[in-house]
Amino acid sequence: FKVATPYSLYVCPEGQNVTLTCRLLGPVDKGHDVTFYKTWYRSSRGEVQTCSERRPIRNLTFQDLHLHHGGHQAANTSHDLAQRHGLESASDHHGNFSITMRNLTLLDSGLYCCLVVEIRHHHSEHRVHGAMELQVQTGKDAPSNCVVYPSSSQDSENITAA
């Protein structure tokens, strides 16, 4: 399977909400021994590999923001902790999963990564990730709404193996 990032750049005004999106593509094993661990974290554009460094989003680690379920099932993060930080991650049964960030500030600008780990019980793991950039702008020149730009075909299917 692959992870696609439909959009690679989000340019938003301060105070706006934004939903960053990834999509799980390809054949997904729905067997009983397979679960999917989906999460989000911040990173930086490494010289060797993007998303290799895992940093928290608004003080929440990738463990705090994870979704854990089988196949293309719907899920949401535990509301209390994430929502106190203005965050919510969600997943639907079409393979889309997202993180919503509320009341953006300049400190939210940066590189965001979605991570999917396919866990086969008693066997191996398969990991893929996608990356996107969030630019939060302030002042009179900021856009009035988030402007969202597509990934190039090269970027839109970010595939990494464990």
Epitope: L9, D141, S144, N145, V147
Partner: antibody
Framework: EVQLVESGGGLVQPGGSLRLSCAAS????????MSWVRQAPGKGLEWVAE????????YYPDTVTGRFTISRDNAKNSLYLQMNSLRAEDTAVYYC???????????WGQGTLVTVSS | EIVLTQSPATLSLSPGERATLSCSAS?????MYWYQQKPGQAPRLLIY???KLASGIPARFSGSGSGTDFTLTISSLEPEDFAVYYC?????????FGQGTKLEIK
């Protein structure tokens, strides 16, 4: 007052090249993404290119990818569109546009006509 | 790509009547923009951020809507209002336009 003034249009043969310019004034040019929009005679409006405020990101629809190049010179408050391998279907009025902000709507220039014909 | 569908394609009304132009987006967008265009002229911004009136535009023009359905209303048509109207989204690249609604004198 925000002003966008396009220039560089004209008659060119199929396969030829043309460079359009847009002179911007009345706002902090380097803070805005800028775009080119075109309108073929009797037709609707079509986005043809955008460039980010710093110039590092450029975007094109499939119809012009590989043929058109958008660029900017923030020191000169100028936007450019280099058009190569021009086709008859590129005949249109080309407008320079600036997106809106938190307090104001978008702005457009008055356009420059590009005619591709032999 | 977000497709914007304007309806009707042509609207025939008389001066003094109320005009309602619709714009439907294939996916949800934050804001809609409306332009008026007359022959040989550049598009003129009427409404930005869905409902804000652009500078110099008469108060008879108004915009509303959210998500996928947006409306431009002209409360009482003046002779100079007969033109082509375009909606546009500036949210998801490519920043698409509707195909236009021609407002003509009945």
């Amino acid at each position: 007052e925000v002003q966008l003034v396009e220039s560089g249009g004209g008659l060119v043969q199929p396969g030829g090249s043309l460079r359009l310019s847009c002179a911007a004034s009345g706002f902090t040019f380097s803070s805005y993404a800028m775009s080119w929009v075109r309108q073929a005679p009797g037709k609707g409006l079509e986005w043809v290119a955008e460039i980010s405020s710093g110039g590092s990101h450029t975007y094109y629809p499939d119809t012009v990818t590989g043929r058109f190049t958008i660029s900017r010179d923030n020191a000169k408050n100028s936007l450019y569109l280099q058009m190569n391998s021009l086709r008859a279907e590129d005949t249109a009025v080309y407008y320079c546009a600036r997106r809106g902000n938190l307090y104001d709507g978008p702005y457009w220039g008055q356009g420059t006509l590009v005619t591709v014909s032999s | 790509e977000i497709v914007l569908t304007q309806s009707p394609a042509t609207l025939s009304l008389s001066p003094g009547e109320r005009a309602t132009l619709s714009c439907s987006a294939s996916s949800s967008v934050s804001h809609m923009y409306w332009y008026q265009q007359k022959p040989g002229q550049a598009p003129r911004l009427l409404i930005y951020d869905t409902s804000k009136l652009a500078s110099g535009i008469p108060a008879r023009f108004s915009g509303s809507g959210s998500g996928t359905d947006f409306t431009l209303t002209i409360s009482s048509l003046e002779p100079e209002d007969f033109a082509v109207y375009y909606c546009q989204q500036w949210n998801f690249y490519p920043f698409t336009f509707g195909q236009g609604t021609k407002l003509e004198i009945k």
